[in-house]
Interface confidence: low
């Protein structure tokens, strides 16, 4: 190509010619070039009109080009140049007109260019200059030359890493002539030992940075006194970890700041063990913004009401413990990436609106309500990248919240109540990667204004997406990626008429169905990449909403066979929606593996008779299989009854219960029956089932056949568990087949009638039979245990060794 | 691949090779040399970066006797008011810095430790350099 050996980054605009051993400016690049990087080439000398071939140039990088001389008019043709970078050039001769013609220059970087003085630097005519970086040079005097009065747009002057030792009143005289200047000045890493008092009197700066300027505490105090009279919007003091630091530092260090007018203060890197860091800041009670970055705060009394700060920032600091914060006027608190103080303790910040507590490894033992933060004004709360956060309140008093971020923290008790019920103003919610297991359909109740919901990297009960979004009518963005989802409710998205972006990628869907998306009138992006989609759920796939513009089906397991021909054809019909079609490849059959789905032509013809016979055969086999499957366990039970006959019962009872009632079974049932008199022996799946044998076989052979009775622990959890109901149905068959058998019902908690009616048989049985009801009172317990023992004693021969157990959670635990 | 020797200590020998095509020169001195049983000292680096060091971070890939540990990301420069003065270094500017280090010893088993250090900086992010350090550890050597 014509531009080689340079690299074309943006055609006709940006070219990178770095380190190509050029001795002269290349002449094979387009006239239209706007960005040109010629760094690390041995150009050595720039003559007049060096860049006449590039009249459109806006950014020119000449770093480390060994340039020693720059002649008059070297850049003469570059009237559009806005950025000129000369870093690392050992300039010895700089003509007075070196920078002439640069009528639009806004940024000049002359770092490490052997510059000894600003006085002789020929930039007085650069009226458009906004940023001048002359750091890492040999400048000894801070005297700002008279030509600075021409630089009325100057915003940044970087004089760091020079040789400035003293600042005198006369040095800044020119700034008095420029009262409207909004200048940020960096003087870090200059070996300062004297600032003449009054030098900064009545000077206004936007920002002043002084880091690693002083070699002793006394020098620091004297120099800060010398800043008296300065009005600065933002003052940054501190040190650097890799530079020589002061030997000592105490609370008197910043006393001189009382004579400055400061709007925002930041202390950056300080590694001293101070008795009480708060005493340092007596002169900073009235700044509006206060920041500590990389400061060691082992002991701190508290940040208390005397401070009038509106914004407090504590970043990358080391704390002995979480600080006590009680600041009446504070509106913004940023407390991020800190170490130590792992347990959040309450703060009292009545005016707080913005709170960022991210990346601290904090544990939070009762989130979240107004009392935690001492405010009802909070609009923004970021608790991301922390430790365990236990939800124990649904944001009472925090109804103003609009932004809430928990990502990559470990949320607990999320499915126990409607955590977000109060947050009707919330617009943004991120609970991605929070170990949340959605087992409660009301999880998002209350979020009527929510527009963005990110919940990637969590999981759902039975890997099924239920109707949890019914109240989120304003949702525009929903991320459900990496949630191990396998199925979704057909009506899961029915209320999301405003949804524009839906990310379902990185799940375990095996088929695609358009039906759930029929109500998404605003949907523009649907991402189903990185699933296992082979085919469609239904024979006939409908169209996606007409608003859809991007459909991502890349990296799925497409089955490119005749039986899926209609699905593959449907995919081709969606071609205009599909993104990255080249990454949509066949996974099966093996001879087509890796082939692009859209370029495939499958010809599929078959004899109609063969199809008819096949379909009929499949139907017959299916019906038989279904019947066998449906009654398989009942048949197995019957076979067992015949085989075992009236064999010896090892257990007094086999207990069926929901794993969610395990505490009660272990702590109450087990304790009282196993350790009582007489002791009863109960069949427990985890103790008495034989490892390696199928669960169903264990239930029937170990549970039913070897037990005299069955105890059924009925509760809300029990009714809602398919596995418990399955066991209960087997128990009924067992009772029917075995004349001696008996089922003892224990109702653990009042079960809603409507729930119970869903299980008609159980409802009838409980209506007709006497059952035991657990009542947690002294008298109630006494009666309960007496009746239960009586029921179990029926037909029991005395056996002094007793153990107690359970039956249903084996399956439930793995399936939920 | 040319091996660059860094130093020897009572229990370790440290060297590095480049793991990128660029192989821009970098000078690394450790004084006194790191002892894995625990030591403190000064790390001196001389380097002329090919990009600004703003937002510099390291990706560390550590191998212990052929066993790979998970990738570790170490952020060195956040982008404003950073801890290290070299974070403000620009492309082509000499970085000549001394960083003090100290660490309490961990009991390392004898063997060969490899650490690939990928330095990434700038916006947009690009690789600055890549070095593969090899540490031969002989716990009982003098």
């Amino acid at each position: 190509e014509s531009w080689e050996p340079c690299v074309e980054v943006v055609p006709n605009i940006t070219y990178q010619c770095m380190e190509l051993n050029f001795y002269k400016i290349p002449d094979n690049l387009p006239f239209s070039t706007k960005n040109l990087d010629l760094s690390f080439n041995p150009l050595r000398h720039l003559g007049s009109y060096s860049f006449f071939s590039f009249p459109e140039l806006q950014v020119l990088d000449l770093s480390r080009c060994e340039i020693q001389t720059i002649e008059d008019g070297a850049y003469q043709s570059l009237s559009h140049l806005s950025t000129l970078i000369l870093t690392g050039n050992p300039i010895q001769s700089l003509a007075l007109g070196a920078f002439s013609g640069l009528s639009s220059l806004q940024k000049l970087v002359a770092v490490e260019t052997n510059l000894a003085s600003l006085e002789n630097f020929p930039i007085g005519h650069l009226k458009t200059l906004k940023e001048l970086n002359v750091a890492h040079n040999l400048i000894q005097s801070f005297k700002l030359p008279e030509y600075f009065s021409n630089l009325t747009n100057l915003e940044h002057l970087d004089l760091s890493s020079n040789k400035i030792q003293s600042i005198y009143c006369t040095d800044l005289r020119v700034l008095h002539q420029m009262p409207l200047l909004n200048l940020s000045l960096d003087l870090s890493l200059n070996p300062m030992n004297f600032i003449q008092p009054g030098a900064f009197k009545e000077i206004r700066l936007h920002k002043l940075t002084l880091r690693n300027n002083f070699d002793s505490l006394n020098v620091m105090k004297t120099c800060i006194q010398g800043l008296a009279g300065l009005e600065v919007h933002r003052l940054v003091l501190g040190e650097f970890r890799n530079e020589g630091n002061l030997e000592k530092f105490d609370k008197s260090a910043l006393e001189g700041l009382c004579n400055l007018t400061i709007e925002e203060f930041r202390l950056a890197y300080l590694d001293y063990y101070l008795d009480d860091i708060i005493d340092l800041f007596n002169c900073l009670t009235n700044v509006s913004s206060f920041s500590l970055v990389s400061v060691t705060i082992e002991r701190v009394k508290d940040f208390s009401y005397n401070f009038g700060w509106q914004h407090l920032e504590l970043v990358n600091c080391k704390f002995g413990q979480f600080p006590t914060l009680k600041l009446k006027s504070l509106k913004r608190l940023t407390f991020t990436s800190n170490k130590g103080g792992n347990a959040f303790s309450e703060v009292d910040l009545p005016s707080l609106e913005f709170l960022d507590l991210s990346r601290n490894g904090l544990s939070f033992k009762g989130c979240c309500s107004q009392s935690d933060f001492g405010t009802t004004s909070l609009k923004y709360l970021d608790l991301s990248f922390n430790g365990v956060i236990t939800m124990s309140s649904n944001f009472l008093g925090l109804e103003q919240l609009e932004h809430l971020d928990f990502q990559h923290s470990n949320l607990k008790q999320m499915s126990e109540f409607s955590v977000f019920l109060s947050l009707r103003n919330l617009i943004y919610l991120d609970i991605s990667h929070t170990h949340t297991r959605v087992a409660f359909n009301g999880i998002f109740n209350g979020l009527s204004s929510l527009e963005v919901l990110k919940m990637a990297g969590n999981s759902f009960q039975e890997n099924f997406l239920p109707d949890i979004f019914t109240e989120l009518r304003n949702l525009t963005f929903l991320d459900l990626s990496q949630c191990q989802l396998e199925q979704l409710s057909p009506t899961a998205f029915n209320s999301l008429s405003s949804l524009q972006v839906l990310n379902m990628s990185h799940n375990n869907f095996f088929s695609l169905d358009t039906f759930p998306y029929k109500c998404l009138n605003s949907l523009q992006v649907l991402d189903y990449s990185l699933n296992h989609i082979m085919t469609s759920k239904k024979q006939e796939l409908q169209h996606f909403p007409s608003s859809l513009a991007f459909l991502n089906l890349t990296q799925n397991d497409f089955a490119c066979t005749c039986e899926h021909q209609s699905f593959l054809q449907w995919i081709k019909d969606q071609r205009q929606l599909l993104v990255e079609v080249e990454r949509m490849e066949c996974a099966t059959p093996s001879d087509k593996q890796g082939m692009p789905v859209l370029s495939l032509n499958i010809t599929c013809q078959m004899n109609k008779t063969i199809i008819g016979v096949s379909v009929l055969s499949v139907l017959v086999v299916s019906v038989v299989a279904v019947l066998v499957y449906k009654f398989y366990f009942h048949l197995m039970l019957l076979a067992g009854c015949i085989k075992y006959g009236r064999g010896e019962n090892i257990y007094d009872a086999f207990v069926i219960y929901s794993s969610q009632d395990e505490d009660w079974v272990r702590n109450e049932l087990v304790k009282n029956l196993e350790e009582g008199v007489p002791p009863f022996q109960l069949c427990l799946h985890y103790r008495d089932f034989i490892p390696g044998v199928a669960i169903a076989a264990n239930i029937i052979h170990e549970g039913f056949h070897k037990s005299r009775k069955v105890i059924v622990v009925v509760s809300q959890h029990f009714i809602q568990s398919r596995w418990c109901i399955f066991e209960y149905e087997i128990a009924q068959t067992w009772q029917f087949l075995s004349s001696r058998a008996g089922i003892i019902f224990i109702v653990l908690q009042k079960v809603e009638k409507t729930l119970l009616r869903q299980q008609v048989e159980l409802y009838r049985l409980l209506s007709r039979n006497t059952y035991l009801e657990w009542e947690d009172s002294v008298l109630g317990r006494h009666i309960f245990w007496r009746r239960l023992r009586k029921a179990l004693l029926d037909g029991k021969s005395w056996n002094p060794e007793g153990t107690v157990g359970t039956g249903c959670n084996w399956q439930e635990a793995t399936s939920i | 691949q040319k091996q660059y020797w860094v130093c020897n200590s009572s229990d370790a020998s440290i060297s590095y090779t480049y793991c990128d095509k660029m192989q821009y020169p970098i000078s690394i001195n450790v004084n006194p040399c790191i002892e894995l049983k625990g030591s403190k000292g000064l790390l001196h680096i001389f380097y002329i970066p090919r990009r600004d060091l703003k937002q510099l971070y390291f990706n560390l890939y550590i191998t212990v006797n052929t066993m790979n540990l998970p990738k570790r990301k170490e952020v060195i420069c956040r982008g404003s008011d950073d801890d290290y003065s070299f974070c403000r270094a620009l492309k082509g500017e000499t970085v000549n810095t001394t960083i003090s280090f100290s660490f309490k010893g961990i009991k390392f088993s004898k063997g060969k430790y490899k650490c690939v250090v990928e330095a990434i900086s700038g916006s947009p992010e690009e690789m600055l350099f890549c070095l593969e350090f090899v540490i031969l550890h002989q716990p009982n050597s003098n």
């Epitope: 508290d302 009680k326 347990a343 303790s345 544990s363 033992k365 001492g374 236990t390 | -």
Partner: antibody, heavy 120, light 106 residues
């Protein structure tokens, strides 16, 4: 119901060490802080420190740093206080108490106390 | 550390009388807890976070205060209220108790 059961009284010699236990029932110690408090005759209550069993984290009043060590074993739902280099000043009743977020980490349940007597 | 000073250190009250125990802090705290300890028993939580009554505590007890001054009031003293009362702050490390007020019933 919530209970904290402390180990029995201890008579120890000066210079020795003692380890007191506090076994919780009715709640999981991982969900709370466990505090230890000292009560000497004719003195008020003195806070020794707390442990956060979930994060294996303990914090001490500087006066007890080096003297007391608080640990917890979540498997047995038990917290421990170990006191070293005992002197007559350490003769006191030591209480464990639960700090629970439902009452803003106030100590809502207390053990019955363990009397430690240091005497030669 | 924050020093909590309780006054009076000993107080004598008649049955049915209203009394107030005070607790002053050497510097501002966010809130105060109060405990009651009867002779030979463990302390018992009375008031948490300045004014919230702990469960099972009679309504004759109430708390108030802010900043450096907090108080516990018993509206109508009963014989069973004879005990030591301690204030306790948990908002600034290290967490401290007051020296206690001993309430005697005449």
């Amino acid at each position: 119901q919530v209970q904290l059961q402390q180990s029995g009284a201890d008579l120890v010699r000066p210079g020795a060490l003692v380890k007191l236990s506090c076994t919780a029932s009715g709640f999981n110690i991982k969900d709370s802080y466990i505090h230890w408090v000292k009560k000497r005759p004719e003195w008020g209550l003195e806070w020794i420190g707390w442990t956060d069993p979930e994060n294996v984290n303990s914090i001490y009043d500087p006066r007890f740093q080096g003297k007391a060590s608080i640990t917890a074993d979540t498997s047995s739902n038990t917290a421990f206080l170990q006191l070293t280099s005992l002197t007559s000043e350490d003769t006191a009743v030591y209480y464990c108490a639960r700090g629970y977020n439902g009452v803003y980490y106030a100590m809502d349940y207390w053990g019955q106390g363990t009397t430690v007597t240091v005497s030669s | 550390q924050i020093v909590l000073t309780q006054s009076p250190s000993i107080m004598s009250a008649s049955l049915g009388e209203e009394i107030t125990l005070t607790c002053s802090a050497s510097s501002s705290v966010i809130y105060m807890h109060w405990y009651q300890q009867k002779s030979g028993t463990s302390p018992k939580l009375l008031i948490y976070r300045t004014y919230n009554l702990a469960s099972g505590v009679p309504s004759r007890f109430s708390g108030s205060g802010s900043g450096t001054f907090y108080s516990l009031t018993i509206s109508s003293v009963e014989a069973e209220d004879a005990a030591d009362y301690y204030c306790h702050q948990w908002s600034s490390f290290p967490y401290t108790f007051g020296g206690g007020t001993k309430l005697e019933i005449k």
